[in-house]
Each structure stands twice: as C-alpha cells, then as structure tokens.
Interface confidence: low
Amino acid sequence: EAHKSEIAHRYNDLGEQHFKGLVLIAFSQYLQKCSYDEHAKLVQEVTDFAKTCVADESAANCDKSLHTLFGDKLCAIPNLRENYGELADCCTKQEPERNECFLQHKDDNPSLPPFERPEAEAMCTSFKENPTTFMGHYLHEVARRHPYFYAPELLYYAEQYNEILTQCCAEADKESCLTPKLDGVKEKALVSSVRQRMKCSSMQKFGERAFKAWAVARLSQTFPNADFAEITKLATDLTKVNKECCHGDLLECADDRAELAKYMCENQATISSKLQTCCDKPLLKKAHCLSEVEHDTMPADLPAIAADFVEDQEVCKNYAEAKDVFLGTFLYEYSRRHPDYSVSLLLRLAKKYEATLEKCCAEANPPACYGTVLAEFQPLVEEPKNLVKTNCDLYEKLGEYGFQNAILVRYTQKAPQVSTPTLVEAARNLGRVGTKCCTLPEDQRLPCVEDYLSAILNRVCLLHEKTPVSEHVTKCCSGSLVERRPCFSALTVDETYVPKEFKAETFTFHSDICTLPEKEKQIKKQTALAELVKHKPKATAEQLKTVMDDFAQFLDTCCKAADKDTCFSTEGPNLVTRCKDALA
C-alpha cells in the first residue's frame, strides 16, 4: 500500500541498525571516493531526518521519494565537481534522471588502494573500542570498491565479520583464529560480488525478462517440487528485489528481500522440504541461507519432457497463444529435471527451443521439423561437459597456481591487447574455479564451473567496455550473456596482433620481491608470464615452462643470497638474455 512517508516506512520496517547500514552502503556505492567520516555524517543526518518522519509523517519533506532525499544529500556535498568531475552534472537533473545519471557513473574498477586488513591486535583494539564504527568502516570499504554489491547480503557479511571478531578477539592467539576465518568470508564475499554484478548486467543490458528467465531456471532446479505458478511468483518477486538493488533502491530491496524470505518460510509446503533449517535463523542469516539452500529431491514420476514440448499435437498452438508462458513452462520443466546443468546452459537450450519453434511453426509440417529438437540439444550439452572435464583434469594435474598460469597463457593469446593487470586478475579468478568447483561431486561440477566462469567473464567485459582494445573481446561481450562463456572458450590465438617488443625492464626484478606475501609474488610472476606471451604469442607451452622455471629458480636463488641486491643486479640481466634465447 502507499505510505505517506516512504522514509518513515522503510525505517520502521528495517529498524535503525539495518537502515543506517543500507544508507551507508548506498552513499558509498554512489560516491566511491568520499571518506568514511564524510559518509557517516550524511548517514547520521538521513537517520535523524527519518526519525523525525517516524514521529510525524506530515513533517516537511517527509513525503519526498527516497531518490529525491538521497540525491539532494549527495548533491549538497562540498567540492563535488573537484572530486567527482562530470558526476556533478547529475545534480543539474531532476528525478528519476538524476538517479539514472548517478548509476551510470558507478565505477566497477575504482582507483582505490587494495583493502588491507590491519594486524590482529590493532583490529581487535578498534573493534572493542567501537564495534559500530568498525563495522561501518567495513561496509564503506567494501561498498565503494564493489558498487553493485548486493546490499542486504553485505549486511550479512558484516554480521559474519562481527561474529568472527567477537569470538577471535577473546582468544590468546588472535592472528591464527582470525586469518582463516576472515579469509573465508572475504573469498565468499568476492564471489558474491561478481555474481551480483552479473545479475545487474543482465538487468541493465537485457531487461527484467532476461533476469526473470535466469530466476525461473535457478529456482526450478532448487525447488523441483514447486509448481510452475509458485516458481513464477518467486521469480517475479526475486526479479523485483534484484531490480531494486541494481537500481540503487537499497532500502526497498532489503525490505522486499525480507518479505520474500518470510513468504518462503510461510509456504514451505508448496516450495521445498529443505527450507526449515534456514527458516529457523534470524533475518540476515535466513535470507542468505535460503539463497544457497540445497536442491530439493526431484519428484520420481516426472514424465519425459518430449510429451508436452515435442510430441503434443498442440505445440505450435500453445506456443502461438502465449509464447512467454509456454517457453517459461519449458524452461521450468527442463530445469527441474536438470539440477546438474548450469543456468547458462539451460537458458541456451530454451533459446534453441524457441528458435526451433519460430522456424518450424511456420512450416507445412511443424512436428516433422521440431521432432528432433531434443536431440539437437546434445552438442550444446556436450560442449560445457567437455569444458569441465578438460579444465578439471588440468587443474588436478597442475594445482591452482599452475592452472591459473595455463589460463593466463590461453587468455593472453586470445586477447593480447588487453592490459596485463586485467588479464592477470581475470586468469587468477578464472583459475580459482578449479579449487571452487572441481572438488565437488560430478553432478555439481558443471553448474558450479559454468555459472562461476560466466560471472568472472562478465567482469572482464565490464572492464573492457571502459577501454575497448580487443575485437575478440568486444565480439564476445556484445552477444547475449549466456553465449559469452562459449564465445570466449572458442576464441583462438589472435592472428591480427603485432607482438610487443621485448623490453628488458619488463623482466627486471629487485630484491623487494623477496619480502612480498606469496600472493603478491605470484602476481609479479604472472605479470611477467603475460608479458612473455605478448612478446611471443605463439610460444609453445614447453618454451614458456622453461622460461618460468628459470625465473622461479632465479627468484629462489637471489632471495636466499646473502647480498640480494647484487644477486638481482648481476643475475637479472643473464635471466633476460636466457629468456630471449629460449623464446627465439
């Protein structure tokens, strides 16, 4: 129902803590360069104003939309043009254009230093002194680096962070308690970020229909006993929630997500037998748990998919009468039978089915034409299955670091024009698919691998959009979201690329590399590997391995030397010469 004051309504629904957290996330995602203190001041002002409206909904400005209220706050920030350049032009517009303008200026790759975790003792001290401020800093730092992070989920990760600190700061050895736990949260949060960015891309580029199709497939896999009407209702609600979050309407998004969780828990009987454990949890944990809930057991007596979608005399009639409903039913029926497929694959199959009906229903004898459509799915299914097998075999053979290097070589050959830091980031993320997915049971590998790769490649596309340099990448990124991964997989060495000149300084290293954490060392070595491939795109795997082994040996020797600087300055040039010879 319509509320006199939107801000009062949301404050009442969400409660002060979540309200403040979400406003902080919203401001941090819009204005990514502002300090925590600047944002915290704005948040307090907005919260105080919300409380005024709760006390009296008729008070001045309480009837204004959230976009108007938040936008006015952002536009009142001093030195907006100096700090944000043309984003300040958004403030000359009226709502809803002003909010759209803010959204367009969100930066997926802001030039902010990496979020460094303080020492355990320091962390625990500031956490104990002021837990609220500490968590505020966490929300601010994550949100500004990830401007599309799913806001209610970020509140959940902040809660996890809080619980870990509460537990570990009471331990004698704080460091060994905190490090693995916080690393786990960080890894999960980063995956959550790329997944949500993919959803927002789907919404932005292809609209609500595309996202709803994704939701129907995903929900049908998870809840195979729910009927089509139930799945459609859940997909519609989930689409609304995601549209709101992607659109910066974080208070509405969190509120509607809580409503959806409530609905699911009240209707477990018609949705799934696996929800009870989630439903027993408090709000943030409940919603998170529901989003990751295990698949319900598939009904035993499902008839063959062919009955309604190939062999029914009325296929074309049913399709013509209500295309979206008929295709939605197909996607639902196919997905509930295939929890072992990725959502991307299921959407490709639905697209193939749609194209087949479009062609065949116009022919003289449609059944003869579409009669083999299910058999024509076979190559579409085999392709990702082979991808999973090949890559998991390689991962098992090489381990994560070696697997990342193999992917780095492959992708540098596909798109050598892309900047080395982007290629290294992409390869490291793509390489993590091995650890994340290849260790899972056979029937869970494909959905894990392909849907994760699709999300990572979406980030590659977003970064490339900013500065397009590779025709290969542009081609794969301009197509539909579900075709991206197969497109990237099919790319081969870019024959149009003119190899980079060999620059000795690119391969010159200093003793400071020895004190770097292992991850940073790996990135340095991977940067060198990408540069080598850019210099020799057709170098064989053996040549590259020889050079990289030599490089690793050089680092090991010099980092163990008594006089490291001398070792690096004398052995370095020899290494460069050997590299050139090995690749000649």
């Epitope: 063959a304 062919a306 009955a307 062999e311 003289a364 004898n365 003869a368 083999t372 076979q378």
Partner: antibody, heavy 119, light 110 residues
Framework: EVQLLESGGGLVQPGGSLRLSCAVS????????INWVRQAPGKCLEWIGI?????TTFYATWAKGRFTISRDSTTVYLQMNSLRAEDTAVYYC???????????????WGQGTLVTVSS | DIVMTQSPSSVSASVGDRVTITCQSS???????LSWYQQKPGKAPKLLIY???KLTSGVPSRFKGSGSGTDFTLTISSLQPEDFATYYC???????????FGCGTKVEIK
C-alpha cells in the same frame, strides 16, 4: 532390463480382425514413442505407425483407416481390421530413440509375432 | 510417391572384404533422417546408424555411414563373420506418415 514382447498373432480369415499386443517392461511408456513395423516373408520392412509418449498417433498413408494403435500403462496395441492376404507378415513393435520423435530410428525391437491371413 | 532404392539387392563377399551398400531416396530425406539396420534370419532388425553417419552405441567402428539429401552409403571396412546379414536403410520425410524402408541388401558368404 528393457523388453518389448509381441503377442496376439495367428491365422485369421480375409476380412477378419485381429488385435496384437506389445508388452513393454523396464521403461515407462509415458516417456517413449513406440512403433509398429511389419515384414512379409522374404520382403521389405514396412512402417505401420507410431504412438508418441503423449498418446498422439500417426500412421503410414496406406495404413490409415484399417489400423489403429492405442496403449494402456504397460502395453501398446495394434488393432487390424478388414485383413487381406497381403497383410500376412511378422509384426514387430519397436521403440523410437528418445529425442527423435519423428525420425526412423528404432533402437529396441520385440521378437515379432506372425500374422497369417488365409482362408 | 516416396521411393527408397537399395543396391545391390545382394552381394557375395569374404571375411576381410570392404563392402559398400547404397541407398537412394526420392525425394530427399528430411534433415538427414536416415538410418541403417542389420537383420539376421529369424531375428528383429538392429539399429546400426542414425542421422546418416552416427554410430549407435556398441556398434563396431568398421561400420560407417555417409551421404546426405538423396544418396547414402553404408560401408563395412573389413567384413567379419558376424556381419553376414541383410541390411536395410530407413528414411524419414517432412511428414512422419511417409517413413519408409529400403528393401534390403543381403550380404552373403562368397
């Protein structure tokens, strides 16, 4: 183990009727298409018709009107009316390869039942 | 009318020989809807090849199907004792009601 087993064949007079049965075990009939095919002694194979998983039936042009295919939960039937001498043949039921509802790909066959039409 | 012509009607060959059987269809089959079957006396036919060239699971690789449109071939690269049988082609058309088989090629021992 999946099996198709025909029965109901025998000697019938011209103009008479006969109902053949194909008992299917090991698979759910609501998931598969089943065909009837016949072979006159020393002659070609001849496709008679098909019943799809959905229950929809199709017939060879020459078989329309005289032959009817139906099924219940475990058996597919071929009802033959106005039989002639040239209908003498071994009658087989056969399953269509899943996913190829309209193609002549029959991967499982029964052992056949002989029908003789003679006075 | 649909006509499916198989040739030769019989062929005598020895173990190890290469045997080629052809199947001509008028009109063209629909979307490569062509199959090959093997039948031994007193037995039901057995599906060897579908979609003109795809081998059914468990069928030895010495059997090879090729062709498209109106002209199709079944080749047995090196005849084995168990291959002596009658071979039929089957075609599917734009109407399912036109499904037709060839009249067979008998492969006999020389």
């Amino acid at each position: 183990e999946v099996q198709l087993l025909e029965s109901g064949g025998g000697l019938v007079q011209p103009g008479g009727s006969l109902r053949l049965s194909c008992a299917v075990s090991g698979i759910d009939l609501s998931n598969y298409a089943i065909n009837w095919v016949r072979q006159a002694p020393g002659k070609c194979l001849e496709w008679i018709g098909i019943i799809w998983a959905s229950g929809t039936t199709f017939y060879a042009t020459w078989a329309k009107g005289r032959f009817t295919i139906s099924r219940d939960s475990t058996t597919v039937y071929l009802q033959m009316n106005s039989l002639r001498a040239e209908d003498t043949a071994v009658y087989y039921c056969a399953r269509t390869v899943p996913g190829y509802s309209t193609a002549p790909y029959f991967d499982l066959w029964g052992q056949g039942t002989l029908v003789t039409v003679s006075s | 009318d649909i006509v499916m012509t198989q040739s030769p009607s019989s062929v005598s060959a020895s173990v190890g020989d290469r045997v080629t059987i052809t199947c001509q269809s008028s009109p063209s089959v629909w979307s490569n809807f062509l199959s090959w079957y093997q039948q031994k006396p007193g037995k039901a036919p057995k599906l060897l090849i579908y979609e003109a060239s795809k081998l059914t699971s468990g069928v030895p690789s010495r059997f090879k199907g090729s062709g498209s449109g109106t002209d199709f071939t079944l080749t047995i690269s090196s005849l084995q004792p168990e291959d002596f049988a009658t071979y039929y082609c089957g075609g599917g058309y734009s109407s399912i009601s036109d499904t037709t088989f060839g009249c067979g090629t008998k492969v006999e021992i020389k």
